[in-house]
C-alpha cells in the first residue's frame, strides 16, 4: 500500500517538534547519557520488506506515544508543543494501520519480524526503566528525548527507502 | 494487568440522559483506546465507540453518532460514556474494555478487548 | 460494513465432546483481526483467542482457532464443565476504527 504523502510531512514535523521541545543543553546532561542499544539493523528497510517493516514501524511509533503521554511526561515538556507531537504520532499510527489493513488482506501477517517487534519493544522498555531510575529527572528527559530523535530519525529514513522501492 | 470500574446501576426515563464512567488502575497506558460496549438483555455484544485519553480522540460507531459523547481524564484515568435521548430499547448493561498492551505487535493489540469492566446496567423506564 | 454471522446459535453437548464454533464474515477479514470471546451468565466477556489463533493468557490449549477469508472456527477439542457458555467473534476494520461482534453461539450441556 501506498502511504499518503501527509505520511511523511507528520513524521518531519514530529521530528521538528521534539527539537523544540528541547528544554536543557545536552552538554548539561553529559553525566546521565546511556547508550539505550537501539536495534538499527532490526528497524533498517534494508533488511526488511514493505510489509514487515509496517508493524515494525507502527510498535516504534506505539511506544514512542506511550512513553510521551506517560503522566510524568506532561510536567517536563511544553503542553504545546507536546499535544502536537502526541497528535502527529497518532495520524502517524493511523495511516501505518490503514496501510496494513490494506496490505495484508486475508495474506499472513509479516510475523517473520516477530524478532525485530521484540527488539523493539525491548529497546523502549530500556528506556522506561531508565527514566524510572532517574526519577523522570530533567536531564533524564532530556537525554529520552534525544534518543526518541534518533529512533524518529531512523525510521523516517525506513519510509523514505521505502518510498523509492515502489 | 489493567482493571476497570465501571460506575453503578441506573434508571432513567425516555429521552433523558446517562452517564457511565469508568475508573481504569493497573499497567494503564492513556495511549491505548477504552471503548464501551452495550448488550441488552438476553442479547449479543455491540461495539459503541472508544477514546484515546491521551489525546481525547473518539471513534463513533455509526448506529450511536448524534446521540453518545466519550469523554475521558487522563488522572486518575477515567472513561466517561454519555447516551443521551434515552429509548427504552437502551436498556442494556454497559462495558468499558481496553486492549491489551502486551501483545505483540501494538497494532495487532489494539483491535481486540483483553480487560473488561464488571457492567454498569441501564434501565430506561417510565 | 462488516457482518459477522456465527453458527449454530446453540449447540447442545456433552462434557468430553468436541465442539467447532463457526464465524462467517461478509466481505475477506485478516485472521490476525478476528478475535474470539467467551461469556458466562452474569459475567464480563473474557478474550480467549486472538489473531486468529493465539490463545490469551490462561486459556487452556483444548481451545483453539483457525480459518482465513470470510470463514473461522473456534474448535474446543475435549468440553469440561467450565466451557459451557456463549462464544463471539469480533472483527475489526480501519480507518475508522471499527470492532464488529456476531451473534454469539451459546454452548449448552445437553
Known amino acids: 500500500c501506498d502511504l499518503p504523502q501527509t505520511h511523511n510531512l507528520r513524521n518531519k514535523r514530529a521530528l521538528t517538534l521534539l527539537v523544540q521541545m528541547r528544554r536543557l543543553s545536552p552538554l548539561s546532561c553529559l553525566k546521565d547519557r546511556k547508550d539505550f542499544g537501539f536495534p538499527q539493523e532490526k528497524v533498517d528497510a534494508q533488511q526488511i520488506k514493505k510489509a514487515q517493516a509496517i508493524p515494525v514501524l507502527s510498535e516504534l511509533t506505539q511506544q514512542i506515544l506511550n512513553i510521551f503521554t506517560s503522566k510524568d511526561s506532561s510536567a517536563a515538556w511544553n503542553t504545546t508543543l507536546l499535544d502536537s507531537f502526541c497528535n502527529d504520532l497518532h495520524q502517524q499510527l493511523n495511516d501505518l494501520q490503514g496501510c496494513l489493513m490494506q496490505q495484508v488482506g486475508v495474506q499472513e501477517f509479516p510475523l517473520t519480524q516477530e524478532d525485530a517487534l521484540l527488539a523493539v519493544r525491548k529497546y523502549f522498555h530500556r528506556i522506561t526503566v531508565y527514566l524510572r531510575e532517574k526519577k523522570h529527572s530533567p536531564c533524564a528527559w532530556e537525554v529520552v528525548r534525544a534518543e526518541v530523535w534518533r529512533a524518529l530519525s531512523s525510521s523516517a529514513n525506513v519510509l523514505g527507502r521505502l518510498r523509492e522501492e515502489k | 494487568e489493567v482493571q476497570l470500574l465501571e460506575s453503578g446501576a441506573e434508571v432513567k426515563r425516555p429521552g433523558s440522559s446517562v452517564r457511565v464512567s469508568c475508573r481504569a488502575s493497573?499497567?494503564?497506558?492513556?495511549?491505548?483506546?477504552i471503548s464501551w460496549v452495550r448488550q441488552a438483555p438476553g442479547q449479543g455484544l455491540e461495539w459503541m465507540g472508544r477514546?484515546?485519553?491521551?489525546?481525547?480522540?473518539?471513534n463513533y460507531a455509526q448506529n450511536f453518532r448524534g446521540r453518545i459523547t466519550i469523554t475521558a481524564d487522563k488522572s486518575p484515568l477515567t472513561a466517561y460514556l454519555e447516551l443521551s435521548s434515552l429509548r427504552f430499547e437502551d436498556t442494556a448493561v454497559y462495558y468499558c474494555?481496553?486492549?491489551?498492551?502486551?501483545?505483540?505487535?501494538?497494532?495487532?493489540?489494539?483491535?481486540?478487548?483483553?480487560?473488561w469492566g464488571q457492567g454498569s446496567l441501564v434501565t430506561v423506564s417510565s | 460494513e462488516i457482518v459477522l454471522t456465527q453458527s449454530p446459535g446453540t449447540l447442545s453437548l456433552s462434557p468430553g465432546e468436541g465442539a467447532t464454533l463457526s464465524c462467517r464474515a461478509s466481505?475477506?477479514?485478516?485472521?490476525?483481526?478476528l478475535t474470539w470471546y467467551q461469556q458466562k451468565p452474569g459475567q464480563s466477556p473474557r478474550l480467549l483467542i486472538y489473531?486468529?489463533?493465539s490463545r490469551a493468557t490462561g486459556v487452556p490449549d483444548r481451545f483453539s482457532g483457525g480459518g482465513s477469508g470470510t470463514d473461522f472456527t473456534l474448535t474446543i477439542s475435549r468440553l469440561e464443565p467450565e466451557d459451557f457458555a456463549v462464544f463471539y467473534c469480533?472483527?475489526?476494520?480501519?480507518?475508522?476504527?471499527?470492532?464488529?461482534f456476531g451473534q454469539g453461539t451459546k454452548v449448552e450441556i445437553k
Open positions: 469480533q472483527s475489526y476494520h480501519s480507518p475508522p476504527p471499527v470492532y464488529t
Open positions: 477514546i484515546l485519553p491521551a489525546l481525547g480522540v473518539t
Open positions: 474494555a481496553s486492549p491489551s498492551a502486551d501483545i505483540i505487535p501494538s497494532i495487532l493489540g489494539t483491535t481486540l478487548f483483553a480487560f
Open positions: 493497573g499497567d494503564t497506558f492513556s495511549s491505548y483506546p
Open positions: 489473531g486468529g489463533s
Open positions: 466481505q475477506n477479514v485478516s485472521r490476525h483481526y
